[in-house]
């Protein structure tokens, strides 16, 4: 399924999205625009992030050691020191008990820049993607994933951290954005809306999708997340939009069927390992890419975002389960956990395919307005 309601091969949101909520001026790049950490009151879309060390919880990664030799990912240090590593864990994003990172929330106080000054940076995420303005970069090759088909053991930690549902990934999941751009997956988490209200973080020509998955990766150039934060390319996130389809998605069901067990904020359960790549679109060759930030405090910049052109289909029931099962802080439902789109401020989104060439009949003479900046490095 490619992006929204378009012909088979048209780019993400290639044509008019049909939404009655066109991009506002604040979504356009402008010198004065400072990023919003939340939507203006009254807007239906709430803002937010998670608690990676920005994209939910980030971990500390160490290379395979003699002792249980695998990446050790502990929580990012945003607020507290990492918890004790157990053995070979990926603790990558390990939300500590007590979770002191949670003095931020979607909407309302405190303003995110007060939680982390980086949230007021100029190159923040998420953003609105306009395929017509994307720069076609033939040097952007298909993504390569290795080790994403996990055996059922060891089981993985699935946690409601109050901001999202997060699956901590074990060592050994390798991803390459291209030659010499190698990463290790740390965790994945989701963003969603509420009944009848979409909740993806990125948008396409102003169109917001029902939900969005983020798989967070650490560059192999860094041993720990805290070393990579804020460094260009230190972290990379693969993002895909989730849409409603006619059939149940069996890969997602392995996680969604366990959400009731972690309905309460701070609760967690263990789930059998699964094929993580099955949670992503099958087409690894068509995507958008730009440099942005974590979408939750600490909002560290330098994050390489790769947003798939193809969407993932879940049944209506599954999308309802996702948005209606978990509880967040203060007896409130965990819903609308997305941050408002942030201004590009001159950034150019690159596409691995000619996204500006809209195959729909309405695009008379499509012009690629931006040229590829990175020749593949």
């Amino acid at each position: 399924q490619r992006l929204p309601r378009m012909q088979e091969d048209s780019p993400l949101g290639g044509g008019s999205s049909g939404e009655d909520d066109p991009l506002g001026e604040e979504d356009l790049p402008s010198e004065e625009d400072s990023p919003r950490e939340e939507d203006p009151p009254g807007e239906e879309d709430l803002p937010g992030e998670e608690d990676l060390p920005g994209e939910e919880d980030l971990p500390e990664v160490k290379p395979k050691s003699e002792e249980e030799g695998s990446l050790k990912l502990e929580d990012l240090p945003t607020v507290e020191a990492p918890g004790d590593p157990q053995e070979p864990q990926n603790n990558a994003h390990r939300d500590k008990e007590g979770d002191d990172q949670s003095h931020w929330r979607y909407g309302g106080d405190p303003p995110w820049p007060r939680v982390s000054p980086a949230c007021a940076g100029r190159f923040q995420s998420p953003v609105d993607i306009r395929p017509q303005l994307a720069a076609f970069c033939p040097a952007l090759r298909p993504l390569e994933l290795l080790g994403f088909q996990l055996p059922p053991l060891p089981e993985l930690r699935l946690r409601n951290n109050g901001h999202s549902v997060q699956l901590t990934l074990p060592p050994g999941l390798e991803m390459a954005l291209g030659p010499g751009r190698e990463y290790r997956a740390l965790q994945l988490h989701l963003h969603w809306g509420a009944a009848g209200r979409p909740g993806s973080e990125h948008t396409v020509e102003g169109h917001r999708f029902p939900a969005e998955i983020h798989v967070v990766h650490l560059s192999t150039a860094f041993a720990r997340v805290d070393e990579a934060l804020g460094r260009p390319g230190g972290l990379a996130v693969l993002a895909a939009f989730l849409e409603e389809g006619p059939e149940e998605n069996s890969a997602y069901e392995q996680l969604l069927s366990r959400l009731e067990e972690i309905a309460e904020e701070g609760s967690e359960t263990q789930v059998p390992g699964l094929d993580i790549s099955a949670l992503l679109p099958s087409d690894f060759s068509r995507y958008f890419q730009y440099e942005g930030s974590l979408t939750t405090p600490p909002c560290a910049q330098g994050v390489i975002w790769t947003v798939f052109n193809q969407t993932v289909m879940l049944s209506a029931k599954q999308l309802h389960t996702l948005s209606d099962t978990l509880w967040g802080p203060g007896d409130s439902r965990l819903q609308l956990n997305f941050r408002a789109t942030q201004p590009l401020n001159g950034r150019v989104i690159e596409a691995s395919f000619p996204a500006g060439v809209d195959s729909s009949p309405r695009a008379a003479e499509p012009v690629q307005l931006n040229s590829c900046l990175a020749a593949g490095d």
């Epitope: 864990q89 290795l146 080790g147 088909q149 055996p151 060891p154 089981e155 263990q270």
Partner: antibody, heavy 122, light 111 residues
Amino acid sequence: QVQLVQSGGGLVQPGGSLRLSCAASGFTFSSYAMSWVRQAPGKGLEWVSAISGSGVSTYYADSVKGRFTISRDNSKNTLYLQMNSLRAEDTAVYYCAKYCSSTSCYRGMDVWGKGTLVTVSS
Amino acid sequence: QSVLTQPPSVSGAPGQRVTISCTGSSSNIGAGYDVHWYQQLPGTAPKLLIYANNNRPSGVPDRFSGSKSGTSASLAITGLQAEDEADYYCQSYDSSLRAWVFGGGTKLAVL
């Protein structure tokens, strides 16, 4: 020291049942997945079943699915294999093995019991 | 027929080097799953020899080493000794079978 002590093997008729036990000591039993592996006389090793540390998730080889049940009692540090509808081809030495920790299978099956012989014959 | 294929037997004289191959497919070794090696001396339980492709547990002599490439793995034994005479098994996970799998085993004879 880390060890696994097995019991429960013996001679049983085809169609019969048997329960194997594996008592663990020297490590935090509930933190590790456990596995059963068998070896028919003169043959190689065959994985039979595995169970997560909590006991919530269980896995079986196709050859025993529906007939064997793996379970554990973490309060007793003991792993079990309930074998029903036994067949002649189930005749083997059965080994229990400590496998994955709660976060990694990196170390393989690093501790094995001495094995217990199950003979299915009329 | 095992999913992981090993030679039924290998042999070598004391002091020599032998290798035992373990050939799999894209659904097991080639999918990136770790390969572990076990040694089974006559009449005893298997013992972990190499874990995660190329790591030795404490107590295993450095004469034993493992490697993995593509859809195959191999175990190398240098400075062969009489006490190395045993059966050797490789083990991994297979995503198609959704099962942990062993090679058929290789009998090492020290001449």
